[in-house]
């Protein structure tokens, strides 16, 4: 599938993660630029977007390994570079984000610092009550947890 075929939202996580320029005020922008934060901020923003790619890949891996995906070929297409549809719709699902936050936390801070940073942000949002608890039933599924335990203990390169 083409990148051009999607009508999904190309949205990011909350603005606080990327420390964005959220105010068009020119003086503020001058000040921030003098601190050298223009392109470095954008790099941080792209870091978070890459982490979303990782999260999506992780979700697709889990769903395919369990054979519970509605579209069972999504991970294969993603690995081939042809999967783009539904990326944002998955990521926009608050429950899915909660699930991924739970999932990634077990990976360890040193291995995936970008993902951990996002998980921490998700945790803050969760504490604020901005996440739903729709995934509780999934999290209670022991079989799924067994699979995730396997998933997070297996090196990514081993699963390719």
């Amino acid at each position: 599938r083409s990148l051009q075929d999607t009508e999904e939202k190309s949205r990011s996580f909350s603005a606080s993660q990327a420390d964005p320029l959220s105010d068009p005020d020119q003086m503020n922008e001058d000040k921030r630029h003098s601190q050298g934060t223009f392109t470095s901020d954008y790099s941080k923003y792209l870091d978070s977007r890459r982490a979303q790619d990782f999260v999506q890949w992780l979700m697709n891996t889990k769903r395919n390994r369990n054979n519970i995906a509605k579209r069972h070929d999504e991970f294969e297409r993603h690995a081939e570079g042809t999967f783009t549809s539904d990326v944002s719709s998955y990521l926009e699902g608050q429950a899915a984000k909660e699930f991924i936050a739970w999932l990634v936390k077990g990976r360890g801070r040193r291995d995936f610092p970008e993902e951990v940073a996002i998980v921490e942000e998700l945790g803050r949002r969760h504490a604020d009550g901005s996440f739903s608890d729709e995934m509780n039933t999934i999290l209670d599924n022991l079989a799924a947890r067994d699979f995730i335990n396997w998933l997070i203990q297996t090196k990514i390169t081993d699963r390719k």
Epitope: S12, A15, P20, S22, T39, Y45, L46, E114
Partner: antibody, heavy 119, light 112 residues
Framework: QVQLVESGGGVVQPGRSLRLSCAAS????????MHWVRQAPGKGLEWVTF????????YYADSVKGRFTISRDNSKNTLYLQVNSLRAEDTAVYYC????????????WGQGTLVTVSS | DIVMTQSPDSLAVSLGERATINCKSS????????????LAWYQQKPGQPPKLLIY???TRESGVPDRFSGSGSGTDFTLTINSLQAEDVAVYYC????????FGQGTKVEIK
């Protein structure tokens, strides 16, 4: 089909300002980040600035620090670039580009609008 | 910023022959978490805007002829045009989207 149509370019003197516009159609404009990329005559491509789907994230290349401001009006499906304190080196074709689902990847480009800075 | 360097700056290839363009990044654009290279190729014909050909280093965009192929990983990438056609005359740019986007200086492909 996706269409991006830039306007607002022209010949201006150094130090003056212009406002470039990009009218978008054929896709859900309010769902996508948008970029401006420029190309000096006979030269390569240079990324200029980005705005997220809702306008909450804005980033600029160092070369346009404090002088350029990107904005968008989702109700009008239009992207803007306010260019101030223009310099000779800002002379270029300015393209608006739609971001793909993957960040900083450009899947559609407008035809461009030429800005010439000359005294 | 990541610096992208293309070679050669220009090349002339006979119709039906193969054109090969190289692109080198000053640092890796491979994201190890998903094993994807954040590298794209664009084609720009005279008087036209760039057109996305390939993303993720090797994935053809929809509608792009299969004579175009991309390869490479990390810092070294290649765009190959098999069986060059007259309509392939253009300037080709690589671009990394791993970090603040930067482009190579372009490679002009002409008919010999």
């Amino acid at each position: 089909q996706v269409q991006l149509v830039e306007s607002g370019g022209g010949v201006v003197q150094p130090g003056r300002s212009l406002r470039l516009s990009c009218a978008a159609s054929g896709f859900a404009f309010s769902n996508y980040g948008m970029h401006w990329v420029r190309q000096a005559p006979g030269k390569g491509l240079e990324w200029v600035t980005f705005i997220s789907y809702d306008g909450s994230n804005k980033y600029y290349a160092d070369s346009v620090k404090g002088r350029f401001t990107i904005s968008r009006d989702n109700s009008k499906n239009t992207l803007y670039l306010q260019v101030n304190s223009l310099r000779a080196e800002d002379t270029a074709v300015y393209y608006c580009a739609k971001e793909a689902v993957l960040a900083a990847l450009f899947d559609y480009w407008g035809q461009g609008t030429l800005v010439t800075v000359s005294s | 910023d990541i610096v992208m360097t293309q070679s050669p700056d220009s090349l002339a290839v006979s119709l039906g022959e193969r054109a090969t363009i190289n692109c080198k990044s000053s640092q890796s654009v491979l994201y190890s978490s998903n094993n994807q290279n954040y590298l794209a190729w664009y084609q720009q014909k005279p008087g036209q805007p760039p057109k996305l050909l390939i993303y993720w280093a090797s994935t053809r965009e929809s509608g792009v002829p299969d004579r175009f192929s991309g390869s490479g990983s990390g810092t070294d990438f290649t765009l190959t045009i098999n069986s060059l056609q007259a309509e392939d005359v253009a300037v080709y740019y690589c671009q990394q989207y791993y970090s603040t986007p930067t482009f190579g200086q372009g490679t002009k492909v002409e008919i010999k």
